[in-house]
């Protein structure tokens, strides 16, 4: 897998899309997880509806939403009210039993709001959270890194 970079602006929303082969992944639930370290665990943030036929229903965990177009083969994740600590390496996953296949590796970069005239270092940071913080979609730029560039290992 190569890694796709999605850039979002602090305070705004970011939409991440993960295309996949709808036939190959037919009947499988999907998930969005955050890689806590280069060889560390990929911590589940949110997953699609327990009933695969209802995967089109948007599910939220805090500020992160997930919805799956199972016919079109596109998993969509929305990060609302993006904060600097939402940056990082994530994975879109297809679940089967206790296993997970990686659909796409995503690097989220959070930029300071250019309309916010405070110094970047003065950005407001919400309270601590064990999960990956509270969540529409206005601003997203993505680019794919070259194949073979990726230093990230698969989920452990």
């Amino acid at each position: 897998h190569n890694t796709t970079v999605f850039q979002g602006v602090a305070g705004q929303s970011l939409q991440v899309s993960c295309p996949y082969d709808s036939m190959k992944h037919w009947g499988r639930r999907k998930a969005w997880c955050r890689q806590l370290g280069e060889k560390g665990p990929c911590q589940r943030v949110v997953s699609t509806h327990n009933l695969w036929l209802l995967s089109f229903l948007r599910r939220w965990n805090g500020s992160t939403a997930i919805t799956d177009d199972t016919l079109g083969g596109t998993l969509t994740i929305t990060l609302r009210n993006l904060q600097p600590h939402d940056a990082g390496l994530y994975q879109c996953q297809s679940l089967h039993g206790s296993e997970a296949d990686t659909l796409r590796k995503v690097l989220v970069e959070v930029l300071a709001d250019p309309l916010d005239h405070r110094d970047a270092g003065d950005l407001w940071f919400p309270g601590e959270s064990e999960s990956f913080e509270d969540a529409h979609v206005e601003h997203s730029i993505s680019r794919s890194l070259l194949e073979g560039e990726i230093p990230f290992p698969p989920t452990s």
């Epitope: 806590l36 280069e38 990082g88 690097l107 970069e109 959070v110 930029l111 601590e128 560039e149 990726i150």
Partner: antibody, heavy 119, light 107 residues
Framework: EVQLVESGGGLVQPGRSLKLSCAAS????????MAWVRQAPTKGLEWVAS????????YYRDSVKGRFTLSRDNAKSTLYLQMDSLRSEDTATYYC????????????WGQGVMVTVSS | NIVMTQSPKSMSLSVGDRVTMNCKAS??????LAWYQQKPGQSPKLLLY???NRFTGVPDRFTGGGYGTDFTLTINSVQAEDAAFYYC?????????FGGGTKLELK
């Protein structure tokens, strides 16, 4: 193997400027946030500044804001720290570090470069 | 800013001993804590992140625990090469702040 090699340190008078460089190798530089952490002689560690992977946003500790400028050249896999209006309290070993994006911990460190601000 | 306080400031142990050092945050930081080791004349090295995840190559005698405001770093069966300063760091939310360090000496 991840390597971070700092250069550009030295003795400088208060009020003057200095530019540190950090040459990175062994990983895809443009995929990572980078940061500088400093350590005053016989003191503890102090985060100085961080930069997103594209260089689109920078974050500074309050005491260096407006004086230090962090930048990067992804084509050259190099990180820079331009330090202006230096003060005696900026005297420290400056470490170039790779930051795990969004988590703020530093998984790889350079060997450090000494900056001495004195008249 | 959240203040990280480490204790004790220094400790002296023998090879094979079990050591526990502490890090206290002035506010709840969840599990958002990292530990570093710095040997004399060297740069710091990451040991643990998110409280208990060992970084690549870190021996399993190093374990982290705690949650909220109180954290521990335990070294089971201390080795001579473990003589160093140990620093905790609040992570995940900026600004990143470090504790003052604990010096581990071996008798």
């Amino acid at each position: 193997e991840v390597q971070l090699v700092e250069s550009g340190g030295g003795l400088v008078q208060p009020g003057r400027s200095l530019k540190l460089s950090c040459a990175a190798s062994g990983f895809t530089f443009s995929n990572y946030y980078m940061a500088w952490v400093r350590q005053a002689p016989t003191k503890g560690l102090e985060w100085v500044a961080s930069l997103t992977n594209s260089g689109g946003s920078t974050y500074y500790r309050d005491s260096v804001k407006g004086r230090f400028t962090l930048s990067r050249d992804n084509a050259k896999s190099t990180l820079y720290l331009q330090m202006d209006s230096l003060r005696s309290e900026d005297t420290a070993t400056y470490y170039c570090t790779r930051e795990w994006a969004g988590s703020g911990y530093f998984d790889y460190w350079g060997q450090g470069v000494m900056v001495t601000v004195s008249s | 800013n959240i203040v990280m306080t480490q204790s004790p400031k220094s400790m002296s142990l023998s090879v094979g001993d079990r050591v526990t050092m502490n890090c206290k945050a002035s506010q709840n930081v969840g599990n958002n804590l990292a530990w570093y080791q710095q040997k004399p004349g060297q740069s710091p090295k990451l040991l643990l992140y998110y409280t208990s995840n060992r970084f690549t190559g870190v021996p399993d005698r190093f374990t982290g625990g705690g949650y909220g405001t109180d954290f521990t770093l335990t070294i089971n069966s201390v080795q001579a090469e473990d003589a160093a300063f140990y620093y905790c760091q609040r992570i995940y939310n900026s600004p990143w702040t470090f504790g003052g360090g604990t010096k581990l000496e071996l008798k």
